[in-house]
Amino acid sequence: QLPPGKPEIFKCRSPNKETFTCWWRPGTDGGLPTNYSLTYHREGETLMHECPDYITGGPNSCHFGKQYTSMWRTYIMMVNATNQMGSSFSDELYVDVTYIVQPDPPLELAVEVKQPEDRKPYLWIKWSPPTLIDLKTGWFTLLYEIRLKPEKAAEWEIHFAGQQTEFKILSLHPGQKYLVQVRCKPDHGYWSAWSPATFIQIPSDFTMNDEQKLISEEDLGGEQKLISEEDLHHHHHH
């Protein structure tokens, strides 16, 4: 019979700067029923508040809905674990919603093999930003990353797409079935999970000159260039 061990708030995330959730790890088990409560105050205030919603985020969590979420304000929070033997407190955690955004994965991932007559064939990848993110307000800049690999390969090939919501990939193995995924991240914040994988079969006649690859104007902001395999790798890889 001991008091509970010290809990630890280990993660806070917001999908869109409008709501956020924090999660804690319980400390050692005192062998008794233990109640957890999260209390917080905003920087510059002394009034303490209790977590408004212990349900939405699942076990050992606190969810802050829209009415409890303020931008540009630091939240100072701690978790109290209590049983009949006593209480233990986590360290205080300072949270600014601006820096904890982790968006949902991008949506509507579409992948197509394009084989124009006048140019080299390429893989065309297109997606939409996650619904919860409102890009029109200018609050958000989302950056995207694509990964792909042949179905049976172990290593992923990763391409950084910047703010684009479409991307072309030229260097692929003909006849292979590829998995393609995309993820996004705000300028300050965390990468989303990868989107569900989309599969694409690369035709056997998908061939090109290995010495040089032609990247389209859209990829390089209007200037068409002939670049080497090594340059291509640097251009796309992040």
Epitope: Q1, L2, P3, D29, G31, L32, P33, Q84, M85, G86, S88
Partner: antibody
Framework: QVQLVQSGAEVKKPGASVKVSCKAS????????ITWVRQAPGQGLEWMGW????????DYAQKFQDRVTMTTDTSTTTGYMEMRSLTSDDTAVYYC??????????WGQGTLVTVSS | DIQMTQSPSSLSASVGDRVTITCRAS??????LAWFQQKPGKAPKSLIY???SLQSGVPSKFSGGGSGTDFALTISSLQPEDFATYYC?????????FGQGTRLEIK
């Protein structure tokens, strides 16, 4: 009201075993546990270990680890402490105690165990 | 293991006196400290928990203080029924340990 009632005094020979019971009443037994503390004649208090009625967890003092078993029976709201391989050094009053609202707020009356050849 | 050292080991005082018993832990115990009173042939009785909180039904002449590793029990005005042995106990971590006791006798 909360009560912990212990079994009666025991006289045992060296090498024997003893099992002391502690019947709890007046509170929700399943949200706590039973702790055992002993006191040799003229000596101080010594924590032996405890058994949780909440999740079955047990913790023993290292010196008793190999020869003590503590259990709780939620159906009868009773805690048990069994000690094996008794020696004369185990002659003591054995107390059970519990946590109802605050640490060790209720105690049994004690059970004298005498080990003598 | 956390060692608990009580002082003095015995103390003579008169009715009406104010007495203080101290207890030192060998490491920080996060204020998880209790005080018990024991009379001959009786079970211990809990007086104080969490270093300074009074157990239900315990008279306010008993008070606990201290933090970290150094703690004290004060009895503000001794009455005949207060002459007994007092133990401190840490319950911060296993094994739970007690001080060796302070015997409070009538002068």
């Amino acid at each position: 009201q909360v009560q912990l009632v212990q079994s009666g005094a025991e006289v045992k020979k060296p090498g024997a075993s003893v099992k002391v019971s502690c019947k709890a009443s007046g509170y929700t037994f399943g949200t706590s546990g039973i702790t055992w503390v002993r006191q040799a004649p003229g000596q101080g208090l010594e924590w032996m270990g405890w058994s949780s009625a909440y999740n079955g967890k047990t913790d023993y003092a290292q010196k008793f680890q190999d020869r003590v078993t503590m259990t709780t029976d939620t159906s009868t709201t009773t805690g048990y402490m069994e000690m094996r391989s008794l020696t004369s050094d185990d002659t003591a009053v054995y107390y059970c105690t519990t946590v109802v609202r605050r640490p060790f707020d209720f105690w049994g009356q004690g059970t004298l165990v005498t080990v003598s050849s | 293991d956390i060692q608990m050292t009580q002082s003095p080991s015995s103390l003579s005082a008169s009715v009406g006196d104010r007495v203080t018993i101290t207890c030192r832990a060998s490491q920080d115990i996060n204020n998880f400290l209790a005080w018990f009173q024991q009379k001959p042939g009786k079970a211990p009785k809990s007086l104080i928990y969490a270093a300074s909180s009074l157990q239900s039904g315990v008279p306010s002449k008993f008070s606990g203080g201290g933090s970290g590793t150094d703690f004290a029990l004060t009895i503000s005005s001794l009455q005949p029924e207060d002459f007994a042995t007092y133990y401190c106990q840490q319950y911060s971590s296993y094994p739970i340990t007690f001080g060796q006791g302070t015997r409070l006798e009538i002068k």
